[in-house]
Interface confidence: medium
């Protein structure tokens, strides 16, 4: 998901310190910059959040928050500061005018400045007609434990907490946030402020249509009765999510976000403090037939990111829009017709779509896994969400062209149980942002913090690319992908996986001057070979191909092109062990794959040779997928041959771990 | 152990009032909605009214409003039923009831009988 | 106001006979229903809640079933002290709680 390269709008004001009364002044040479939402109709401007340096305390942050003000008067402004923020993020919220940016941006402490703006609930249209009876049985789905050692919490609109689907469910907390209703005319009805929460608490815990039959849920309002907040009222129920965690520690919480705005580094920063503090969140995918990398909370890496198909595994079309796509998305879930409580009474049901009913869903699985299994973390939650999604069901067609690679084709599931499935090696599929077409234009793919990186490839539409490497950033490894000169630009593809007690490295080998091509194998005691990767400093690799069969009894070893340096991921784990698949194709052909049998979990996939008519390999699901370009524009068959490598791998300690607890 | 214990019944004169009350133990008071129900000799169960000891909001079955009033004092653990403006019809056993879940009664007081008589 | 019809009003059985109680909503009520057992001069019982599923202490030979308008309660061998009054009941919006007529279960 998202990172760091988020398509918002970013003013860089670079401003030398003034000494203006300041008695302290910010480090040498940093700058603060100031954010705000690429969708002009979503902006607040007036409200901004200030956001401060990580390791800022609160008493700095209320000092700062005066010297702003105090330093705004001698100007002759007024400011409020509306709120001060800490337990998730240092810093404050603050309505001024936009003059006083430049003076904001220099003050000590200062990361960041970001634009309030608009969020906005994802479920259209809001009522539809009453459907009654539900179209399945109530008795038709009955779950083992209805996830009741979890509590899920949900930042929405009011909800009517009397509804019979939720009533002793939700926990309506005293959390408000929400701006006021546009429209001079608009009279608020408590079922239609209702609406949008009071459907979703139903779909996550409802009595007789909810996923999670016995999870506890607890309400925040974050939304008015026209489903519309602000990313700060948002920041502040996090923040009051957070504070409540610490206050009274209870078992595993899911926060359900089932809304979207623009992209926003302080929300998506918000929601990574909490995910890093063992929360899970789940959200909205957004419905704007659209890239959900440009939208947040649906931007956030540590989110679960959730998009909408209907009864038939497509995408679902919401008027002129519809579901979002992307690398950002995570999976989808039902998300069209979905039945549940309608605050219009409290016994009534009502359908409505969206990505919130998707999310909602996804919430439920997660609240009932976690009951089952409490100590999952957010990574193994997310992998075990992927691994038991139904896979490859969703017609891809409905999707731009260029988005379809990036979207995963995953429908979530339950787990067929909610237990026993300790023994599988998890992997999952992790696509960068677009490196842009610039000669040395890279682009970086990342693992979640307890996930390691066991492969790296890279793609490129035009295939013009320089391959790819795994190198460490931060005490971690990471894939990054090189574009060529001339080329549109590449994707860098992470083989992230969970692999306890693991101990990886790469092993390096320059290009080799000889004929027979660069060759690198794992060559420490215990380490095994779990990813191969190449890159190349020449703009275009020559024809030659190396030996694509390996010599027998050489399966740790990674072969490539002469003019290419070779990467090989070497690691250690208890009881892993792992076995090199190869499926070559001597015809040319656009697509080569090869898949890990049963039991057995794919972990590096690469193309061999890597020559420039190679677009790149990536894996979907447990196959290797290597594209080469279409051979009748290239004209040549002489290169044609094109072999996927796949890496399998498993481990015998996890599946004797798991029938000890049997 | 969970307890519910009615106390207060006894004969009233029609026109007459009287404060049934509900005494709970064994469990948090505060997380269980707390019912009404009555019963007229040789009859069925109806409904009269419930209370949410944790926030004191109440419900009342339409045919009671004016007439019930369901009340709780929470340092005592004890729930109230008082009944006004009684008739020879409201002569009944009144049982308190806890709701598990929603509506599903899962623990009951043993009863009061209430009769209304000159 | 939802109207629930138990039938029959009274079931004569032997023990070890199996007794079917059933119970009709007049509109869709999902599987808000719950089912009580009531003997003489003492308070309900809960038996079955949201359709199907067994109380605490509820013996399997007592079992739910159904959903939507049409339920059923189910005891699959009469012991001697399963004779007694049962009585349906759903949540609903006005009344929230409304209760079945009752069926009497007695020793043929």
């Known amino acids: 998901q998202e990172d760091e390269d988020g398509d918002y709008e970013e003013l860089v004001l670079a401003l030398r310190s003034e000494e203006d009364g300041l008695a302290e002044a910010p480090e040498h040479g940093t700058t603060a910059t100031f954010h705000r939402c690429a969708k002009d109709p979503w902006r607040l401007p007036g409200t901004y959040v200030v956001v401060l340096k990580e390791e800022t305390h609160l008493s700095q942050s209320e000092r700062t928050a005066r010297r702003l003000q105090a330093q705004a008067a001698r100007r002759g402004y007024l400011t409020k500061i509306l709120h001060v923020f800490h337990g998730l993020l240092p810093g404050f919220l603050v309505k001024m005018s936009g003059d006083l940016l430049e003076l904001a941006l220099k003050l000590p402490h200062v990361d960041y400045i970001e634009e309030d703006s608009s969020v906005f609930a994802q479920s259209i249209p809001w009522n539809l007609e009453r459907i009654t009876p539900p179209r399945y049985r109530a008795d038709e789905y009955q779950p083992p434990d209805g996830g009741s050692l979890v509590e899920v919490y949900l930042l929405d609109t009011s909800i009517q907490s009397d509804h019979r689907e939720i009533e002793g469910r939700v926990m309506v907390t005293d959390f408000e946030n929400v701006p006021e209703e546009d429209g001079t005319r608009f009279h608020r009805q408590a079922s239609k402020c209702d609406s949008h929460g009071t459907h979703l608490a139903g779909v996550v815990s409802g009595r007789d249509a909810g996923v999670a039959k016995g999870a506890s849920m607890r309400s925040l309002r974050v939304l008015n009765c026209q489903g519309k907040g602000t990313v700060s009222g948002t920041l502040i129920g996090l923040e009051f999510i957070r504070k409540s965690q610490l206050v009274q520690p209870v078992g595993p919480l899911v926060v359900l976000l089932p809304l979207a705005g623009g992209y926003s580094r302080v929300l998506n920063a918000a929601c990574q403090r909490l995910a890093r503090a063992g929360v899970v969140l789940v959200t909205a995918a957004g419905n704007f037939r659209d890239d959900a990398c440009l939208y947040s909370p649906a931007s956030a890496p540590e989110v679960i990111t959730v998009g909408a198909t209907n009864a038939q595994d497509q995408p679902v079309t919401l008027g002129t829009l519809g579901t979002n796509f992307g690398r950002c998305v995570d999976l989808f879930a039902p998300g069209e017709d979905i039945i549940g409580a309608s605050s219009d009474c409290s016994t009534c049901f009502v359908s409505q779509s969206g990505t919130s009913q998707a999310a909602a869903h996804v919430a439920g699985i997660a609240a009932m896994m976690l009951s089952a299994e409490p100590e999952l973390t957010l990574a193994e939650l997310r992998q075990r969400l992927i691994h038991f999604s139904a896979k490859d069901v969703i017609n891809e067609a409905w999707f731009p062209e260029d988005q379809r690679v990036l979207t995963p084709n995953l429908v979530a599931a339950l787990p067929p149980s909610t237990h026993g499935a300790g023994w599988q090696l998890f992997c999952r599929t992790v696509w960068s942002a677009h490196s842009g077409p610039t000669r040395m234009a890279t682009a970086v793919a990342r693992c979640a913090p307890d996930e390691e990186l066991l492969s790296c490839s890279s793609f490129s539409r035009s295939g013009k690319r320089r391959g790819e490497r795994m190198e460490a950033q931060g005490g971690k490894l990471v894939c990054r992908a090189h574009n060529a000169f001339g080329g549109e630009g590449v994707y860098a593809i992470a083989r992230c996986c969970l692999l306890p007690q693991a101990n990886c490295s790469v092993h390096t080998a320059p290009p080799a001057e000889a004929s027979m091509g660069t060759r690198v194998h794992c060559h420490q005691q215990g380490h095994v070979l779990t990813g191969c990767s190449s890159h190349w400093e020449v703009e275009d690799l020559g024809t030659h191909k190396p030996p694509v069969l390996r010599p027998r009894g050489q399966p740790n070893q990674c072969v490539g092109h002469r003019e290419a340096s070779i990467h090989a991921s070497c690691c250690h784990a208890p009881g892993l062990e792992c076995k090199v698949k190869e499926h070559g194709i001597p015809a040319p052909q656009e697509q080569v794959t090869v898949a890990c049998e049963e039991g057995w979990t794919l972990t590096g996939c690469s193309a061999l040779p890597g020559t420039s008519h190679v677009l790149g390999a990536y894996a979907v699901d447990n196959t290797c997928v290597v594209r080469s370009r279409d051979v009748s524009t290239t004209g040549s068959t002489s290169e044609g041959a094109v072999t996927a490598v796949a890496i399998c791998c498993r481990s015998r300690h996890l599946a004797q771990a798991s029938q000890e607890l049997q | 152990e969970v307890q519910l214990l009615e106390s207060g019944g006894g004969l009233v004169q029609p026109g007459g009032s009287l404060r049934l009350s509900c005494k709970a133990s064994?469990?948090?008071?505060?997380?269980?909605?707390i019912n009404w129900v009555r019963q007229a000799p040789g009859k069925g169960l109806e409904w009269i009214g419930r209370?949410?000891?944790?926030?004191?909001?109440?419900r009342y079955n339409e045919k009671f409003k004016g007439k019930a009033t369901i009340s709780r004092d929470n340092s005592k653990n004890t729930l109230y039923l008082q009944m006004n403006s009684l008739r020879a019809e409201d002569t009944a056993v009144y049982y308190c009831?806890?709701?598990?879940?929603?509506?599903?009664?899962?623990?009951w007081g043993q009863g009061t009988l209430v009769t209304v008589s000159s | 106001e939802i109207v629930l019809t138990q039938s029959p009003a009274t079931l004569s059985l032997s023990p070890g006979e199996r007794a079917t109680i059933t119970c009709r909503a007049s509109?869709?009520?999902?599987?808000?229903l719950n089912w009580y057992q009531q003997k003489p001069g003492q308070a309900p019982r809960l038996l079955i809640y949201?359709?199907?599923n067994r109380a605490t202490g509820i013996p399997a030979r007592f079992s739910g079933s159904g959903s939507g308008t049409d339920f059923t309660l189910t005891i699959s061998s009469l012991e001697p002290e399963d004779f007694a009054v049962y009585y349906c009941?759903?949540?609903?919006?006005?009344?929230?709680?409304?209760f079945g007529g009752g069926t009497k279960v007695e020793i043929k």
């Open positions: 009941q759903v949540w609903d919006s006005s009344p929230p709680v409304v």
């Open positions: 209370i949410d000891p944790g926030n004191g909001g109440t």
């Open positions: 064994g469990y948090t008071f505060s997380r269980y909605g």
């Open positions: 949201d359709a199907s």
């Open positions: 009831a806890r709701a598990n879940d929603g509506y599903s009664f899962d623990y």
């Open positions: 509109q869709y009520v999902g599987s808000y």
